[in-house]
Amino acid sequence: MMTGTIETTGNISAEKGGSIILQCHLSSTTAQVTQVNWEQQDQLLAICNADLGWHISPSFKDRVAPGPGLGLTLQSLTVNDTGEYFCIYHTYPDGTYTGRIFLEVLESSVAEHGARFQIP
């Protein structure tokens, strides 16, 4: 029986050209985490395997950094990075847990404009 839950950073936003940390945390289970996959919609970004450690997809090696912890750091963000990200925890004996994060990458001017004209 799967008793665990995944907590994520939820919906987040960041500025174009900046960086962001994607974080998930598996709790309420004693299952052993054997691997975590980080995926963006239909693309595999990286894995952290209990035996082998981190492996970043070669397609993202220049913009993705492992950690902190089991999280993932995305760098040099572009508007095309906007979308859903998934942390997929492979565990034993529970099976697979999946968390979802939505990232919105904003043009710098848009982010500044929004901050400057916020309604109290």
């Epitope: 054997t34 691997q35 996959n37 995926e39 239909d42 693309q43 595999l44 894995i47 395997n49 082998l52 492996h55 997809s57 070669p58 397609s59 993202f60 090696k61 997929i88 492979h90 697979t96 999946t98």
Partner: nanobody, 116 residues
Framework: EVQLVESGGGLVQPGGSLRLSCAAS????????MGWFRQAPGKEREFVAT???????TYVDSVKGRFTISADNSKNTAYLQMNSLKPEDTAVYYC??????????WGQGTLVTVSS
């Protein structure tokens, strides 16, 4: 589940070449990271090279310029072209793959022996 079958190992003289193949079958949809690791007698398994569906690749420093990893996406097969082989390249070479949403899967290994 994903199954991996390696082939192409064997005995080769120093300076020679071999081409390893790793064919994936089963649950092979979506993006992937496929790669090669090796384990020499009495040593730990070490990373050699990886490739993604997008075509990017990474290598351990000791094989850069001598080994080339490639893939045929239509066949879900990865290749490792090994040139200018050295005695220290002698090892069991293992294919490994992760497909979208899936766990890491290992092949059974293929022995490469570099000796005169």
């Amino acid at each position: 589940e994903v199954q991996l079958v390696e082939s192409g190992g064997g005995l080769v003289q120093p300076g020679g070449s071999l081409r390893l193949s790793c064919a994936a079958s089963g649950r092979t949809f979506g993006d992937y990271i496929m790669g090669w690791f090796r384990q020499a007698p009495g040593k730990e398994r070490e990373f050699v090279a990886t490739i993604s569906r997008g075509g990017g690749s990474t290598y351990v420093d000791s094989v850069k310029g001598r080994f080339t990893i490639s893939a045929d996406n239509s066949k879900n097969t990865a290749y490792l072209q090994m040139n200018s082989l050295k005695p220290e390249d002698t090892a069991v070479y293992y294919c490994a793959a992760v497909f979208s949403r899936g766990p890491l899967t290992w092949g059974q290994g293929t022995l490469v022996t570099v000796s005169s």
